[in-house]
């Protein structure tokens, strides 16, 4: 059975990509680089420059061992662009022998008018332009090629699609004299798929479209369109699936209503309503038909779009998602939480749990957090004793077996995993919370007290003493 991974303290960064020497493979010629050693003493800088140049030219050959790097490819079709008109692109790490392809959509909020897009361009240009993208990225979590970090998908072909359209992957409008920015999220996905077909995707068995945060919502908005695109291009045998992480939002009532001034304070329904018009946003056809013209914003909300999707989708969502709380104007500042807010937060968890009731493939831990699948410690969190990679593996199996007309859940291999305990961090495997101001890790007891929970009140309904409850939470039972 699955070994419990204790190998990276929660919240820590993954190790840098290894820089290891690798001998040339058998039969490969060893290239030689001429170095001019004359008058080295007189011109050390020039000599060092040559050595540096040599090292840089050798690096791509040497970093073959545990190299986690995905390499940047800007789109050949340069008319499919980021917000500022620079070409969009993707990072790719191919895996010989695998017919599984993982396409990951990056997240990073959105902007929905000229003012907040200008501000975003000033402060977060990487999310609007490809001009400063690095040549490589390290694959972590579900994008890792290390079996210990990514137990079930390590051998897949990995594709990371950077988010540079600021439109929740929904836009279909190009930059023009009238439009200061292009919003081409939906078109970027289509173009990446088209280019990947020439790089081996044509032989795929399974394409998993995954994403976190705005990328997770992007999965819900695009998964059926990708399946349709592949069918039209003559690849109906490729099974398209979705994995939406932290993109299942509620259009609930904000804790405190504020006017729609900027991305963070604007109620999500209003932000999306404005965004769709600004981006020329497109939503899944079957969902669009369910709502009147001008009401397409509804399709950005998981519980409304999900029932209309044809492709299988696995939903991963923290019950107390930090981005959801942010748009609901809940800001945990370090001051103890008042009862009204505590009840609001608990109710949010209850509502979210309710929306996942009919989602057969779901993983929803009772934690206060945001995003999980490309975190290095994504294997740590468990719901009812099952980790997320294990649940995804069970989902794989259930989809494989459903072709054999078996509709019953696999024994000992659950895919519907939603925490039922009612308060944040009642699940002992939740990522460690840090005090926003001191940076100190908080244990469960400190966190719950900070959240304004009286330990007596929490323990009583479970027939426990507060000390017993704290012991259980600390030990992970």
């Amino acid at each position: 059975s699955e070994g419990r991974k204790t190998w990276r303290r929660r919240g820590q960064q993954p190790p840098p990509p290894p820089r290891t020497e690798a001998a040339p493979a058998a039969g490969q010629p060893v290239e030689s680089f001429p170095l001019d050693f004359t008058a080295v003493e007189g011109n050390m800088d020039s000599f060092m420059a040559q050595v540096k140049s040599l090292a840089q030219s050798l690096y791509p050959c040497s970093a073959q061992q545990l190299n986690e790097d995905l390499r940047l490819h800007l789109l050949l079709n340069t008319s499919v662009t980021c917000n500022d008109g620079s070409p969009a692109g993707y990072y790719l790490k191919e895996s010989r022998g695998s017919r599984r392809w993982l396409l990951f959509l990056e997240g990073g909020w959105y902007c929905f008018n000229r003012e907040n897009c200008d501000s975003r361009y000033d402060t977060m240009r990487r999310l609007m332009s490809s001009r400063d993208w690095p040549r490589t990225r390290t694959g972590t979590g579900i994008l890792s090629s290390q079996p210990e970090e990514n137990p079930y998908w390590w051998n897949a072909n990995m594709v990371f699609i950077p988010y540079c359209s600021s439109d929740v992957w929904s836009g279909a409008s190009s930059k023009s004299e009238k439009n200061e920015y292009a919003f081409m999220g939906a078109l970027i996905i289509q173009e990446v798929v088209r280019e990947l077909l020439g790089r081996g995707l044509s032989g795929a068995k399974v394409l998993l479209l995954a994403g976190s945060s705005a990328g997770g919502t992007g999965v819900l908005l695009n998964v059926d369109r990708v399946a349709e695109q592949l069918e039209k291009l003559g690849y109906p045998a490729i099974q398209v699936r979705g994995l939406a992480d932290s993109g299942w939002f509620l259009d609930n009532k904000q804790y405190r209503h504020t006017d729609c001034v900027d991305t963070i304070t604007c109620a999500p329904t209003e932000a999306i309503r404005r965004g769709i018009r600004y981006w020329n946003g497109v939503v899944p056809e079957r969902c669009r038909r369910q709502f009147q013209e001008g009401e397409e914003w509804n399709c950005f909300f998981g519980y409304k779009v999900y029932p209309t999707l044809r492709c299988p989708v696995f939903v991963v969502q923290w019950l107390f998602d930090e981005a959801q709380l942010t748009v609901d104007n809940v800001h945990l500042t370090g001051q103890p939480v008042q009862e009204g807010l505590r009840l609001y937060i608990q109710n949010l968890g209850r509502e979210l749990r309710h929306t996942l009731k009919d989602v057969p493939a779901s993983f929803a831990p009772a934690c206060l957090s945001h995003e999980i699948i490309i975190r290095s410690h994504w294997t740590d969190v468990q719901v009812k004793g099952t980790s997320l990679p294990r649940a995804l593996h069970c989902w794989d199996r259930s989809l494989h077996d459903s072709h054999k007309a078996s509709k019953t859940p696999l024994k000992g291999c659950p895919v519907h995993l939603v925490d039922s305990c009612p308060w944040p961090h009642c699940n002992p495997s939740c990522p460690t919370v840090r005090d926003q101001f001191t940076g100190q890790e908080m244990n469960v007891a400190q966190f719950l007290m900070h959240m304004g929970f009286d330990m007596q009140t929490v323990a009583q309904p479970q027939g426990l003493e507060p000390s017993e409850l704290l012991g259980m939470l600390s030990n992970g039972s």
Partner: antibody, heavy 118, light 106 residues
């Protein structure tokens, strides 16, 4: 040249513990996961667990969890496996193996023979 | 856990012959499979990884094939140094080895 040099044979009594070593050379020790594998006499191979020398992260086969402990000493590029509460069933050859870029074990130690007998 | 069923348990062959060893997984392992050779008194040696890729410095008479749950290792034109035990191994969640196949000289 990559080499994994394991410690010599061990003869121990039932109930005791043993700690064997695997010294790595010829590559950057912290960049590769190290796995341990058991082979009983005339039998197949059985995976015990792994350790990542970079940060000490590990994972175990449930069967060995709690009885096997994997550690490393980065300064000497050495991986260790301690086995506790030994019985005759633990008599076997134990290998350390480096997990390379292929996702599989590209270099193996020569093995440490453990005999548990009273 | 995923089980790996290797067959045959043993086989006899002569130098120059071709032999095939198979490995069946209890469920789809998506080519996350390797083959190792172990000669008496030696450590195992990686032959083939991710189902079909030949490891460095392994002669081309060895080849791997298969996908899904069924995989095989073929050795063409057997050489004296090829006799020994062969193991399949997968790395998909945890690591599991097949029971092994003993290849003996006829």
């Amino acid at each position: 040249e990559v080499q994994l040099q394991q410690s010599g044979p061990e003869l121990v009594k039932p109930g005791a513990s043993v700690k064997m070593s695997c010294k790595a050379s010829g590559y950057t020790f912290t960049d590769y996961y190290m796995h341990w594998v058991k082979q009983s006499h005339g039998k197949s191979l059985e995976w015990i667990g792994y350790i990542y020398p970079n940060n000490g992260g590990n994972g175990y086969n449930q069967k060995f969890k709690g009885r096997a402990t994997l550690t490393v000493d980065k300064s000497s590029s050495t991986a260790y496996m301690e086995l506790r509460s030994l019985t005759s069933e633990d008599s076997a050859v134990y290998y350390c193996a480096r997990r390379g870029a292929t996702g599989f074990f590209d270099y193996w130690g020569q093995g440490t023979t453990l005999t548990v007998s009273s | 856990d995923i089980q790996m069923t290797q067959s045959p348990d043993s086989l006899s062959a002569s130098v120059g012959e071709t032999v095939t060893i198979t490995c069946r997984a209890s469920e789809n392992i998506y080519s996350t499979l390797a083959w190792y050779q172990q000669t008496p008194g030696e450590s195992p040696q990686l032959l083939v990884y991710t189902g079909t890729n030949l490891a460095d410095n392994i002669p081309s008479r060895f080849s791997g094939s298969g996908s899904g749950t069924q995989y095989s290792l073929k050795i063409k034109s057997l050489q004296p140094e090829d006799f020994g035990s062969y193991y399949c191994q997968h790395f998909y969640g945890t690591v599991t080895f097949g029971a092994g196949t003993k290849l003996e000289l006829k």
